[in-house]
Amino acid sequence: MGCDRNCGLIAGAVIGAVLAVFGGILMPVGDMLIEKTIKREVVLEEGTTAFKNWVKTGTTVYRQFWIFDVQNPDDVAKNSSKIKVKQRGPYTYRVRYLAKENITQDPEDHTVSFVQPNGAIFEPSLSVGTEDDNFTVLNLAVAAAPHIYQNSFVQVVLNSLIKKSKSSMFQTRSLKELLWGYKDPFLSLVPYPISTTVGVFYPYNDTVDGVYKVFNGKDNISKVAIIESYKGKRNLSYWPSYCDMINGTDAASFPPFVEKSRTLRFFSSDICRSIYAVFGSEIDLKGIPVYRFVLPANAFASPLQNPDNHCFCTEKVISNNCTSYGVLDIGKCKEGKPVYISLPHFLHASPDVSEPIEGLHPNEDEHRTYLDVEPITGFTLQFAKRLQVNILVKPARKIEALKNLKRPYIVPILWLNETGTIGDEKAEMFKTQVTGKIKLLGMVEMALLGIGVVMFVAFMISYCACKSKNGK
């Protein structure tokens, strides 16, 4: 009888020990299985989960625009006053709804190439007005002409055309015209076959971004989605030195197993440069734990504050000998047009940049850029890309529309907020397929280990108690 009981207790302890050992073994084995599955599923090739979502994003992406409506155009043109602006928006478009095209796998160098078609559909229900709403904005052609043609002879010629076309420093344009293009009356008088259509994003619809060539991760998962080349080149030819490099991914995904200590590098064709994000916080996105990576202020700092940025300072006059910060001259990437990119409302920009503009209210929460990355897969499940488009306008003695200006202005035209969040259905699917399975495996591991240890300890204590009782 005593033997049966003791044997039972020993058996219980053994079973507990086995369960605990099995739970313990399951931890590295399970992790290995998860890693193997993740590695298989994030590869960019036909049949994987990643590939399906990569070809055509399952996320609805919106691009909201706020236009800076100039309140005192005549005063600025005549007296070189501060520019008073009032933002109007949002005007929302659906973007990135088109699948990648010309997808070609290269099995030799383990890359996949593609182009990303551009398209934008206006969403009236998510907008404060229509595409026909009018705004007073800087005359893009008049501001750019003397910057492109710094030759005084040609400026006299251009002045004749500006006067003839009755153009001035500011103009009134509809949202549709401003964003997607309008026939400029001044440029239309140039007697040579030049493009006379002007728009902040012209041309956009029916164009493509790329060709991108990215690593598919088949041979090395830590390189998955990293851009190997853009438009057939490994460099951009816009910046000197290492600033010209194409680093990281396109920000839609990153190599898996993202750690908080990692700096996420990505290339954005919108800003004609590679940039980076650092860990900000852990958040819960529809039940999925994600890491929020944010663009740090020092990404936009002057070389004085961040020496790594020295090669992004390509001109010395407007930048006050590279001491100004928070604006990026991307003219080289925009056919020499005086286009400057910044964060909305000149967030993280030096006071000299925003001083000539009234009506700006920078706000970290509203105007910063972030990426919410699921750390196991490296997928970006939510993002907000915020940037502002500005045009430099300088005094030009030979151009009557600009001759009264006493200083250069970096004039805000608009700012945009491009956002995407994983849909509820997709989030559920993601939880079921990825985080759910990992959670379940973790729970099984912990349960086995816990139950095993408890059983082993309980049965061993019972066995020992029994033994000492029998001994007495």
Partner: antibody, heavy 117, light 107 residues
Framework: EVQLVESGGGLVQPGGSLRLSCAAS????????IHWVRQAPGKGLEWVAW????????YYADSVKGRFTISADTSKNTAYLQMNSLRAEDTAVYYC??????????WGQGTLVTVSS | DIQMTQSPSSLSASVGDRVTITCRAS??????VAWYQQKPGKAPKLLIS???SLYSGVPSRFSGSGSGTDFTLTISSLQPEDFATYYC?????????FGQGTKVEIK
Amino acid sequence: EVQLVESGGGLVQPGGSLRLSCAASGFTIDAFGIHWVRQAPGKGLEWVAWIAPYGGYTYYADSVKGRFTISADTSKNTAYLQMNSLRAEDTAVYYCARSFFGYFDYWGQGTLVTVSS
Amino acid sequence: DIQMTQSPSSLSASVGDRVTITCRASQDVSNWVAWYQQKPGKAPKLLISYATSLYSGVPSRFSGSGSGTDFTLTISSLQPEDFATYYCQQHSNAPLTFGQGTKVEIK
């Protein structure tokens, strides 16, 4: 086809006047503007006067300022150079030329102006 | 006014020779320089604009280089029809100014 034809040259006494014409075809002078360039016998080229597109501006070399006037009749697609108070040193072949960005892509055949007593 | 100084004022060369004519501006004119060819009794003909841009219909043996103040016209292999006078011109500032010319003669 773009063509420029000058006329109006000839012999004139010092202090006299002459009006040169430049008839353009194949393009509108209004859109481009017209220049007059002269070449004294055996010498180099000298830029004389310019009328900018749409008549928005006129410019003269110091040597002719106050004596020469450039104008255009857009209905006739013709440019003119009114030359007053002519001097012996104004003797030259006068060319009209088309330019937009400051280089001359089309030239007329030239008309000779001789200032002599 | 911007002075354009051409050198040499004349040169003798043979068919097939490589010929180089230089032009110096008295101040920076960026790349706003044109080159012309003129034959006796004829109007000048545009060869090059923006210092390096070959005008349509001009043979590729003609090329231009330079930026700022120093400019060069090169004829890679002189042909019989190339014997003429060559002028540089700055089209940066009014008054537009020409070099004094370089006469290319048969050796």
